[in-house]
Amino acid sequence: EEELQVIQPDKSVSVAAGESAILHCTVTSLIPVGPIQWFRGAGPARELIYNQKEGHFPRVTTVSESTKRENMDFSISISNITPADAGTYYCVKFRKGSPDTEFKSGAGTELSVRAKPSAPVVSGPAARATPQHTVSFTCESHGFSPRDITLKWFKNGNELSDFQTNVDPVGESVSYSIHSTAKVVLTREDVHSQVICEVAHVTLQGDPLRGTANLSETIRVPPTLEVTQQPVRAENQVNVTCQVRKFYPQRLQLTWLENGNVSRTETASTVTENKDGTYNWMSWLLVNVSAHRDDVKLTCQVEHDGQPAVSKSHDLKVSAHPKEQGSNTAAENTGSNERNIYGGSG
């Protein structure tokens, strides 16, 4: 009878993570008597995967009927494959003895595991930035195999080109991670904008994974201020408004100062939203000019999103004859000693 040969017909097998891998092995003879064992890797550090003779291998089942001696098929199925199972598997025939001695090994079957990348996670800068500034976004995805992967960046559907990508580790590994950093220039219109990281991999069957970041979490659009004096509502009263326009986010505190003294502080609440996602707000101050003998300097001071305050002032002139009031015009002082100032917002 010819000497036993161990045949592993498949040089390589590729399996998706979570599936079962079938590793084929047949022998050409019933002798010598002794067990078949499967190992991952070669040499002294090889890992025992299955031993026909003994042991508990819960993930391994024999493919063929192993209770018949004439069976020469020692193929195994390994369930619930993970990237950690990747490697070269050897079917090895042993000769019975004390100890069992290796008689012949198959040529090996390389098992590669196709593992999907995790959902990309996009993160932006820790602090908000203002338009015209360049900010960095990072995208990370892990656990994929094989190593080949494609990553693209988009802003509102437009592909970005200013980014750097690394896949780790550089050498052989059971699975890989990708890390990419993209630079994005902010504009005042970016409140509604999205930055998208798109990952394409063989395991995704042409349906890439996407991670998004809303620029609303990154951008700060500082407000523009305009202080105007409205026509007289009633005898001796002047309505001064502070228009706070095109700001984001909403967190805003406004303080009215009269000749440098705090008159009233309020927090933006009932704001109106613009199409571009920024907000407008108006605060008004009703000044009883009869309470003033001298000119009044009214200042609208705005602290937006914890930033240093910006302000706009308006000189309210107290003159001898009342007239139609326009922006930055004076109102007649009636001579009243009362200092009545009323305020509101909208």
């Epitope: 002798i31 018949k68 004439e70 004390s98 069992d100």
Partner: antibody, heavy 118, light 107 residues
Framework: EVQLVESGGGLVQPGGSLRLSCAAS????????MHWVRQAPGKGLEWVSA???????YYTGSVKGRFTISRENAKNSLYLQMNSLRAADTAVYYC????????????WGQGTMVTVSS | DIQMTQSPSSLSASVGDRVTITCRAS??????LAWFQQKPGKAPKSLIY???SLHSGVPSKFSGSGSGTDFTLTISSLQPEDFATYYC?????????FGQGTKLEIK
């Protein structure tokens, strides 16, 4: 059903010969190592002989040169030709199948009695 | 030849008892050790192979252990049908050899 049935035992005089047969059913005998084991009255078990799948044969020291193990694949049968029998060969002879990969005994026949006496 | 020595040669026990029989080989036999049960007038029955693996249909109250030269057969809770003679056997190399047997009797 996997089964082994021995036959051919009986009374024989010292120096005589006997041929034991073992008919296998439910499996292909040629695919297994096959054995003969005996048990003298009131004694323990003693392995006698074996034949491997390649036709290689093995014997315990006391029967070497006197006993011959063989098989006939067409009849799915195992044989033990016993010559120059001695009183010490008196025993129940069992036909036994070796295990799938390690030759551990798994299937036993019911046995056949061989008595060597004058 | 490899000598197999069983102990004890006989053992008295009661129904429900847990009993252990030992078998020692004169040289290392790896774990190529089998256990058999034989009742009077009957053919032996295979219980255990490779020291600890149960043959198909053998109840789990039987268990085997050991490797190298020292082996044990344990019956966890004796039932009336378990009173019989038990043999160990090495099958690592020819000639295969048996222990002399342990007769398990009802106390």
């Amino acid at each position: 059903e996997v089964q082994l049935v021995e036959s051919g035992g009986g009374l024989v005089q010292p120096g005589g010969s006997l041929r034991l047969s073992c008919a296998a059913s439910g499996f292909t005998l040629s695919s297994y190592d096959m054995h003969w084991v005996r048990q003298a009255p009131g004694k323990g078990l003693e392995w006698v002989s074996a034949i491997g799948t390649a036709g290689d044969t093995y014997y315990t020291g006391s029967v070497k040169g006197r006993f011959t193990i063989s098989r006939e694949n067409a009849k799915n049968s195992l044989y033990l030709q016993m010559n120059s029998l001695r009183a010490a060969d008196t025993a129940v002879y069992y036909c036994v199948r070796g295990g799938v990969w390690d030759d551990a005994f798994d299937i036993w026949g019911q046995g056949t009695m061989v008595t060597v006496s004058s | 030849d490899i000598q197999m020595t069983q102990s004890p040669s006989s053992l008295s026990a009661s129904v429900g008892d847990r009993v252990t029989i030992t078998c020692r080989a004169s040289q290392d036999i790896n774990n190529y050790l089998a256990w058999f049960q034989q009742k009077p007038g009957k053919a032996p029955k295979s219980l255990i192979y490779t020291a600890s693996s149960l043959h198909s249909g053998v109840p789990s109250k039987f268990s085997g252990s050991g490797s190298g030269t020292d082996f044990t057969l344990t019956i966890s809770s004796l039932q009336p049908e378990d009173f019989a003679t038990y043999y160990c056997q090495q099958y690592v190399s020819y000639p295969y050899t048996f222990g002399q047997g342990t007769k398990l009797e009802i106390k």
